[in-house]
């Protein structure tokens, strides 16, 4: 025979239409409604009777589809552990964290739940820029031609060394990955103790 | 320990309106899981489920009284109700309130039943 | 419109063993439950979902299934059993909750 048209409705093969919105009930062999985002199971179904759903209450949650018999509680971002906030929870989702600036994800299960500082990537080299910030600790790769980086620093970026010409000045010392141009006035000539310095 | 008691009129004039109230003690009948019941047992006979309701209003009725049946809750009262309409003399009975037991359409509480007599 | 079907009456000694049966159509795809009624005094749940005893029901009441028909056992049978005994389950569509038509148990 048909099915019925809306749950509760017997099932034969154990499976139901709408996997993502019903649930077998193994007891009395029947698909019944599963809960929506922010709610929480309030009466469990029979045979007669579909599930009865209600809202989670302040600080908790249901993010999916559910036959939870309540609602998880809304954990706050742990700075010990390096996390701060980016959104608040709602009844629908989960507090959403993120690592603090200056520090990447070391351990993750589902999410994240412990950051750690990003090495230092030391001078002539930046960190590579990733997808999403805080997923990974630095890979240092080496400033391109024409850029240098003179700190060890985790967040530091490559600059594009000096053009002592649009100055109007000369350059004394060619820039190199660790250091910017050399520049100098054109009617000076540079003291030998002066190098990648830059003279008006 | 959660106890049921119904009240109302004993005799009501055919064509007229049932209504019964059951109240609830021992227990809130905003429980999260418990739907209530109404149930009747003509004199001398077997027992007729007429309806449940939880305590946010959701109801289910049987198809046979349905046209003529509303079941309503109070939540600040702790109580349920029963109205029914256009009584004959075939709605004479003793009328159950009773709590079911949570995802089952079984009674595990029962009120000790009202008479109701529909007679002009 | 579904029914349940219990026989009018039941008679046994003490001491012996009582079966009440109750068949329908769909009990193989719904639970039973049994209730013991006394003169005057609401219903009593017995057994639930076929062969469950609430706390407080004696051992000696057991509840079986086969096919379309349940049987509520009653094993060593006392005085105190008279009573009227009703079985419940759903209509075939399971939109509606149905009573058997009762049994007396008679203690002889």
């Known amino acids: 025979s048909q099915p019925q048209a809306v749950p509760p409705y017997a099932s034969e093969n154990q499976t139901c239409r709408d996997q993502e919105k019903e649930y077998y009930e193994p007891q009395h062999r029947i698909c019944c409604s599963r809960c929506p985002p922010g709610t929480y199971v309030s009466a469990k179904c029979s045979r007669i009777r579909d599930t009865v759903c209600a809202t989670c209450a302040e600080n908790s949650y249901n993010e999916h589809w559910n036959y939870l018999t309540i609602c998880q509680l809304c954990r706050p971002c742990d700075p010990v552990m390096g996390l701060e906030e980016i959104a608040p929870c709602t009844s629908k989702r989960k507090t959403q964290c993120r690592c603090q600036p200056g520090m990447f994800c070391a351990a993750w299960a589902l999410e994240c739940t412990h950051c750690e500082l990003l090495s230092d990537c030391p001078p002539g080299t930046e960190a590579e820029l990733k997808d999403e910030v805080g997923k990974g600790n630095n890979h240092c790769v080496p400033c391109k031609a024409g850029h240098f980086q003179n700190t060890s620093s985790p967040s530091a970026r490559c600059q594009p060394h000096t053009r002592c010409e649009n100055q109007g000045l000369v350059e004394a010392a060619p820039g190199t990955a660790q250091s910017d141009t050399t520049c100098k006035n054109p009617l000076e000539p540079l003291p030998p103790e002066m190098s990648g310095t830059m003279l008006m | 320990q959660v106890q049921l008691q119904e009240s109302g009129p004993g005799l009501v004039k055919p064509s007229q309106t049932l209504s019964l109230t059951c109240t609830v003690s021992?227990?809130?009948?905003?429980?999260?899981?418990?739907?209530w019941s109404w149930i009747r047992q003509h004199p001398g006979k077997g027992l007729e489920w007429i309806g449940f309701?939880?305590?946010?209003?959701?109801?289910y009725y049987n198809p046979s009284l349905q046209s003529r049946v509303t079941i309503s809750v109070d939540t600040s009262k702790n109580q349920f109700s029963l109205k029914l309409n256009s009584v004959t003399a075939a709605d004479t009975a003793v009328y159950y309130c009773?709590?079911?037991?949570?995802?089952?359409?079984?009674?595990?509480?029962w009120g000790q039943g009202t008479m109701v007599t529909v007679s002009s | 419109s579904y029914e349940l079907t219990q026989p009018p009456s039941v008679s046994v000694s003490p001491g012996q063993t009582a079966r009440i049966t109750c068949s329908g159509d769909a009990l193989p795809q719904h639970y039973t439950y049994w209730y013991q009624q006394k003169p005057g005094q609401a219903p009593v749940l017995v057994i639930y979902k076929d062969n469950e005893r609430p706390s407080g029901i004696p051992e000696r009441f057991s509840g079986s299934s086969s096919g379309t028909t349940v049987t509520l056992t009653i094993s060593g049978v006392q005085a105190e059993d008279e009573a009227d005994y009703y079985c419940?389950?759903?209509?075939?569509?399971?939109?509606?909750?149905?009573f058997g038509g009762g049994t007396k148990l008679t203690v002889l």
């Open positions: 309701i939880y305590f946010t209003g959701i109801t």
């Open positions: 009773a709590r079911v037991i949570p995802g089952e359409d079984a009674f595990d509480i």
């Open positions: 419940q389950s759903a209509d075939i569509s399971g939109t509606y909750v149905v």
């Open positions: 021992g227990g809130s009948i905003s429980s999260d899981g418990y739907f």
